[in-house]
């Protein structure tokens, strides 16, 4: 429906509070280096303008698009050229090119200081004295570090953040109450950001069709009782929501997400028996709950897939009449029967089936040609099954930290050109798959493992895209979305790599190592391990294990010494020399 004023329309739909929060998130995701106060000023100016449009939709400039209004506002920032360099050139462009330009300048790894958590009392005082500013600062800090964070979901996180402070700042032991909650929110936030980053990458790099296919698989698994047309209705609306959020249209995105939640709750009977509890919650919780709802039970009367997709005499006729609809139905039917498969595997199966039909429907005996098509799926299914079995066995044998090390060695040998911080971050996240998925029941393991790995490998892809250094990474990241994980799994040791020259500084440690948290110590050790592999790519796992054990013993010894710094200075070079010998 056409509205005289888009900004007034969204202000009225969303309400002032959500409107302001979403504009703050949008601006923070675009201008990631701007100070908080500058953003607050811009948000207040936009909000005051929106109110004039609500009062009179025909008022001056109220008919302008949101991109025009927001872009004009961003381009008033005085220090744009000094702070952002060539991003300032975006302001010379007209819409829609200007917005596209801003999107291209979003930085997945902005040069921002790590967030330091103040003392609990300091945080509680700030929360109690200036609650609104405190919560808006949270939105700003998360949004600028995660420029693709799913905006309506970030408002949900802010609500949880507020609830944690409201409860814990009253508690007898504030820290014991608050810190675990903040840790959990941080971890959930990082996971949410990474999942959304994959959605945006799917849309931006592989197009709407790829995203819709993935969504059909997931929604069909969740709502196996729903009719195909209901699944595609939800998928179509979901695609619109994510296209908007990934494109920076956060007000439209949040508004449409609320509409989708409303539709789903009004049509529970056609979708799933699992939505009832979600639908009783207020908006932000409701949308979050619907997005994470468990799979409904499969209908009992599902007939064999082969009836319609192998045995039927009309397979080629139906395929030829409407290829996209036929393939959509195949994906829906297969997915609703297989909650135990990963979405990526289901997409590979659909791709294989389509390729077989393309080939067979052009032959004299199509049925004879595609009769065994489902048998051809077997190796595709066994690949992720073996991946899960092998990696969960390793995880159970090693535990998370050593499993991360195993993956770090594996990936450093595959793509040694990638920067050490990226290899460490990605391998640590890959290793968390064990903790997250290996304890799950058999039927949930594969979707958990492979779809989680897809999210983590996408982090590697987006970080690598910023500064490409490896053709092999580029190839795996760009050739096929559904085959990214198998592509990385199939990479062997890079035999063309010339070992990195030894740099003593890389392997020099100081007493500050002893004051680091366990996590920070692990990162230090894993950084050294990656550098070691880059220096000695032919080293065996046994050799590396020995060196790492010696290294752990060295750190433990020096951290217990009276003169820690002297110990590090004396014992460090000895360890390096011994390691050189062990790896020769």
């Amino acid at each position: 429906d056409a509205h005289k004023s888009e900004v007034a329309h969204r202000f009225k739909d969303l309400g002032e509070e959500h409107f302001k929060d979403l504009v703050l998130v949008a601006f923070s995701q675009y201008l990631q280096q701007c100070p908080f106060e500058e953003h607050l000023k811009l948000v207040n100016e936009v909000t005051e303008f929106a109110k004039t449009c609500v009062a009179d939709e025909t008022a001056e400039n109220c008919d302008k698009s949101l991109h025009t209004l927001f872009g004009d506002k961003l381009c008033t920032v005085a220090t744009l050229r000094e702070t952002y360099g060539d991003m300032a050139d975006c302001c010379a462009k007209q819409e829609p090119e200007r917005n596209e330009c801003f999107l291209q300048h979003k930085d997945d790894k902005p040069d921002l200081p790590p967030l330091v958590r103040p003392e609990v009392d300091v945080m509680c005082t700030a929360f109690q004295e200036h609650e609104d500013t405190f919560l808006k600062k949270y939105l700003y800090e998360v949004a600028r570090r995660h420029p693709y964070f799913y905006a309506p979901e970030l408002l949900f996180f802010a609500q949880k953040y507020k609830a944690a402070f409201t409860e814990c700042c009253q508690a007898a032991d504030k820290g014991a109450c608050l810190l675990p909650k903040l840790d959990e929110l941080r971890d959930q936030g990082k996971a949410s950001s990474a999942k959304q980053r994959l959605k945006c990458a799917s849309l931006q790099k592989f197009g709407e069709r790829a995203f819709k296919a993935w969504s059909v698989a997931r929604v069909s698994q969740r709502f196996p009782k729903a009719d195909f047309t209901e699944v595609t209705k939800v998928v179509t609306d979901l695609t619109k929501v994510h296209t908007e959020c990934c494109h920076g249209d956060l007000l439209e995105c949040a508004d449409d997400r609320a509409e989708l939640a409303k539709y789903m709750c009004e049509n529970q009977d056609s979708l799933s028996s699992k939505l009832k509890e979600c639908c009783e919650k207020p908006l932000l919780e409701k949308s979050h709950c619907l997005a994470h709802v468990e799979n409904d039970e499969m209908p009992a009367d599902l007939h064999a897939l082969t009836d319609d997709y192998v045995e039927s005499k009309d397979v080629c006729k139906n395929y030829a009449e409407a290829k996209d609809v036929f393939m959509g139905m195949f994906l829906y039917e297969y997915s609703r029967r297989h909650p135990d498969y990963s979405a990526m595997l289901l997409l590979r199966l659909a791709k294989a089936y389509e390729a077989t039909l393309e080939k067979c429907c052009a032959t004299a005996d199509p049925h004879g040609c595609y009769a065994k098509v489902f048998d051809e799926f077997q190796p595709l299914v066994e690949d992720p099954q073996n991946l899960v079995k092998h990696n969960c066995e390793l995880f159970e044998q090693f535990g998370e930290y050593k499993f991360q090390n195993e993956l770090l060695v594996r990936y450093t040998k595959k793509v040694p050109q990638v920067s050490t911080p990226t290899l460490v971050e990605v391998s640590r996240n890959l290793g968390k798959v064990g903790t997250k998925c290996c304890k799950q029941p058999e039927a949930k393991r594969m979707p958990c493992v492979e779809d989680y790995l897809s999210v983590v490998l996408n982090q590697l892809c987006v970080l690598h895209e910023k500064t490409p250094v490896s053709d092999r990474v580029t190839k795996c990241c760009t050739e096929s979305l559904v085959n990214r994980r198998p592509c990385f799994s199939a990479l062997e040791v890079d035999e063309t790599y010339l070992p990195k020259a030894f740099n003593a500084e890389t392997f020099t440690f100081h007493a500050d190592m002893c004051t680091l948290s366990e996590k920070e110590q692990q990162v230090k050790k894993q950084t050294a391990l990656a550098e070691l592999v880059k220096h000695k790519p032919k080293a065996t796992n046994e050799q590396l294990k020995t060196v790492m054990e010696d290294f752990a013993a060295f750190v433990e010894k020096c951290c217990k010494a009276d003169d820690k710094e002297a110990c590090f200075a004396e014992e460090g070079p000895k360890l390096v020399a011994a390691s050189e010998t062990a790896l020769a």
Epitope: D227, F228, T229, E230, T232, K233, T236, D237, Y263
Partner: nanobody
Framework: EVQLLESGGGLVQPGGSLRLSCAAS????????MGWVRQAPGKGREWVSL????????YYADSVKGRFTISRDNSKNTLYLQMNSLRAEDTAVYYC??????????WGQGTLVTVSS
Amino acid sequence: EVQLLESGGGLVQPGGSLRLSCAASGFTFNHYTMGWVRQAPGKGREWVSLIHPSGTVTYYADSVKGRFTISRDNSKNTLYLQMNSLRAEDTAVYYCAKWEKKYFDYWGQGTLVTVSS
């Protein structure tokens, strides 16, 4: 009892347009996906288009994509098919049909569309 009554067929020249209508009764129209199916002389039935109850999601056979537009007015219990750039191969009896999960379970009597110069 479910009733579907098509209208709007007729003779049209190649490149011309027609709009078919289908009046539905005997069921809760806005709860069901609806569609159009056609049968050319001497041929089998061919699916043409589908529309979700909300009217916001549509599906088309590849042969009509970009030329035909399906729509519905739930307040009038009516289904439409706007046919543009008609070709001789579009000549057929067009049936309005009600969709139930995976198949069409009810059909109208059909309306004849003839594309000829």
